[in-house]
Interface confidence: low
């Protein structure tokens, strides 16, 4: 058993046949010594008396809010949550496996630049009685600070018969060094509580591996005289690290016909312009990637040829 | 060529070669993004590689003030990786394919280190840890880890030379 936060405790249970469970001793936070009784949740049934209560926690029915009282007055609360290890594996029931980039990926994170700021998100099908708290650090043995905000519901989607809820959180490394080569990964820890079930999820990554620039901005076409060619120009996204002579991007320019089946013409360039042939009804798209490290491409920025 | 003690390197040449190094490092191990090698236990494997750290002066401001600190650090790393790529880890079984980019990568690391430090000048170099994996699968894992780490190192070096070529070239 360990304390998650004030008056909230997590009991780690081997979810096993005939498992004896965990013996837990609760102590009433009061100077009083006698006349103390204990109840669980909304029930008025007295579970025991005295300053301490010893319980055997085996099932969810044994978890919940234990309250000690004296003469009708509430003295203190202890909320017991269960963390299940089932068949040798900690339960991961609350979050959905996103399966990208590999199985058992519950948290996904992205950064728009090297400033030490990143966003993580996760999915669940649970709509109520759900809380999350997020902690992060750089390295684990001698952790350096990363500050995370509160997790918020960022999207709702309908998937078949189910509703899916996306939560996200923004974090910022306290003393980021954008130009350095990371040697210790960022660790992100999410505590999830659904009703009386506790679970924790972790992710470990280098910022360089989760970089995904915003799409290029101000994408413009300039027709070239007496030619089917156009000059496409664009700018670095505002959110990308500066100076651009140091934090450089490379770009992919694509000409795509109306039909998905039509052959795509692609040009790769380090410049912020390119000359391409603009076909009727086609569109021109440009995306960006770190020039020196193959992390994710940005989403496409597009303009129609016409 | 760089002459330790203050004169500038051939920024543009260094820029071109370091960008080539980036391309080669990724072609030598392209699927690296799909493997979480940190799960495989890092023990002594790549902990001892020289990293370009915050105080090494490789940021734009540090390069403007005095690029020598940073160039020395990059040189140290290049020599370190050049030795690793020429070691038993890469030359032993399972042998690399004949067209593997590792050979080119090895030669380019040497080329860039020589651009930074002509013969006759000596910056202090870092000792290579003695990594002699006994099993072929351990060697394979070590190669992945070294290439992974090299990708991060040469990315920073390429940024340094690109910025130097754009802003510090005479």
């Amino acid at each position: 058993i360990w304390e998650l936060k004030k008056d909230v405790y997590v009991v780690e249970l081997d979810w096993y046949p005939d498992a004896p469970g965990e013996m837990v001793v609760l102590t009433c936070d009061t100077p009083e010594e006698d006349g103390i009784t204990w109840t669980l949740d909304q029930s008025s049934e007295v579970l025991g008396s005295g300053k301490t209560l010893t319980i055997q926690v085996k099932e969810f029915g044994d978890a919940g809010q234990y309250t000690c009282h004296k003469g009708g007055e509430v003295l203190s609360h202890s909320l017991l949550l269960l963390h299940k290890k089932e068949d040798g594996i900690w339960s991961t029931d609350i979050l959905k496996d996103q399966k990208e980039p590999k199985n058992k990926t519950f948290l996904r994170c992205e950064a728009k630049n090297y400033s030490g700021r990143f966003t993580c998100w996760w999915l669940t099908t649970i709509s109520t009685d759900l809380t999350f708290s997020v902690k992060s650090s750089r390295g684990s043995s001698d952790p350096q600070g990363v500050t995370c905000g509160a997790a918020t519901l960022s999207a709702e989607r309908v998937r078949g018969d189910n509703k899916e809820y996306e939560y996200s959180v923004e974090c910022q490394e306290d003393s980021a060094c954008p130009a350095a080569e990371e040697s210790l990964p960022i660790e992100v820890m999410v505590d999830a509580v659904h009703k009386l079930k506790y679970e924790n999820y972790t992710s470990s990554f280098f910022i360089r591996d989760i970089i995904k620039p915003d799409p290029p901005k101000n994408l413009q076409l300039k027709p070239l005289k007496n030619s089917r060619q156009v000059e496409v120009s664009w700018e670095y996204p505002d959110t990308w690290s500066t100076p651009h002579s140091y934090f450089s991007l490379t770009f992919c320019v694509q000409v795509q016909g109306k039909s998905k089946r039509e052959k795509k013409d692609r040009v790769f360039t380090d410049k912020t312009s390119a000359t391409v042939i603009c076909r009727k009804n086609a569109s021109i798209s440009v995306r960006a990637q770190d020039r020196y490290y193959s992390s994710s491409w940005s989403e496409w920025a597009s303009v129609p040829c016409s | 060529r760089a002459v330790p003690g203050g004169s500038s390197p051939a920024w543009t040449q260094c820029q071109q070669l370091s960008q080539k190094l980036c391309t080669l490092a990724w072609s030598a191990h392209p699927l690296v993004g799909h493997m979480d090698l940190r799960e495989e236990g890092d023990e002594e494997t790549t902990n001892d590689v020289p990293h370009i750290q915050c105080g090494d002066g490789c940021d734009p401001q540090g390069l403007r003030d005095n690029s020598q600190f940073c160039l020395q650090r990059i040189h140290q790393g290049l020599i370190f990786y050049e030795k690793l790529l020429g070691s038993d880890i890469f030359t032993g079984e399972p042998s690399l394919l004949p067209d593997s980019p590792v050979g080119q990568l090895h030669a380019s690391l040497l080329g860039l280190s020589q651009l930074l430090q002509p013969e006759g000048h000596h910056w202090e170099t870092q000792q290579i840890p003695s990594l002699s994996p006994s099993q072929p699968w351990q060697r394979l894992l070590l190669r992945f880890k070294i290439l992974r780490s090299l990708q991060a190192f040469v990315a920073v070096a390429a940024r340094v030379f690109a910025h130097g070529a754009a802003t510090l070239s005479p």
Partner: antibody, heavy 114, light 112 residues
């Protein structure tokens, strides 16, 4: 008293599907994972997958690559295992087993034959 | 997948004599929490398997104390101190340290 009661024997043709049920009683159905295990004649036991009845989350043995689907009906305290694209090697006794494998159903014989 | 190798395949025993079944795992079943995630089952003819031992050495309820489990993370043993006629059947080891859970090939215990 804890009990897991499975549906009766089935005979199927190759290429068909079979759905075996497992009704639980005597305990809180949603509190315990349900595993499915099969045993071909004279062979070792083979774990097929597991479901958490509370959330419907599943983990499958990749050997059955998309052929197995485990579901539950919470209101009926029943777990189901469906195996599709049957072949003769799928002839086996299929068992459901509660978390920790302390309680097993009586088994359902599925025969695949043309 | 973790491979469980069980020996012997067949074990003829005289009632009252001890018996020992071995199970070797291709990967350690010992977790950081100090527990070894291994089960032993007995399957009597025409019956479902019954759990004898879990967490390598803990007897399931109702299992006689003549059955005991021991071992390291990879080499596991089931011992019966004095075999009785009712102990005949096929004994299986099973790892539940990681998915997919896997079983040994079984050891058939028969009375001499």
């Amino acid at each position: 008293e804890f009990q897991l009661v499975q549906s009766g024997a089935e005979v199927k043709k190759p290429g068909a599907s079979v759905k075996v049920s497992c009704k639980a009683s005597g305990y809180s159905f949603t509190d315990h994972n349900m595993n499915w295990v099969r045993q071909a004649p004279g062979q070792r036991l083979e774990w097929m997958g597991v479901i958490n009845p509370n959330y419907g989350t599943t983990t499958y043995n990749q050997k059955f690559k998309g052929r197995v689907t485990i579901t539950v009906d919470q209101s009926a305290s029943t777990a189901y295992m469906e195996l599709s694209s049957l072949r003769s090697e799928d002839t086996a006794v299929y068992y459901c087993a509660r978390r920790g494998f302390a309680y097993w159903g009586q088994g359902t014989l599925v025969t695949v034959s043309s | 997948d973790i491979v469980m190798t069980q020996t012997p395949l067949s074990l003829p025993v005289t009632p009252g004599e001890p018996a020992s079944i071995s199970c070797r795992s291709s990967k350690s079943l010992l977790y950081k929490d100090g527990k070894t995630y291994l089960n032993w089952f007995l399957q009597k003819p025409g019956q479902s398997p019954q759990l004898l031992i879990y967490l390598m050495q803990t007897r399931a309820s109702g299992v006689p104390d003549r059955f005991s489990g021991s071992g390291s993370g990879t080499d596991l043993t089931l011992k019966i101190s004095r075999v009785e006629a009712e102990d005949v059947g096929v004994y299986y080891c099973q790892q539940i340290a990681e998915y997919p859970f896997t079983f040994g090939s079984g050891t058939k215990l028969e009375i001499k």
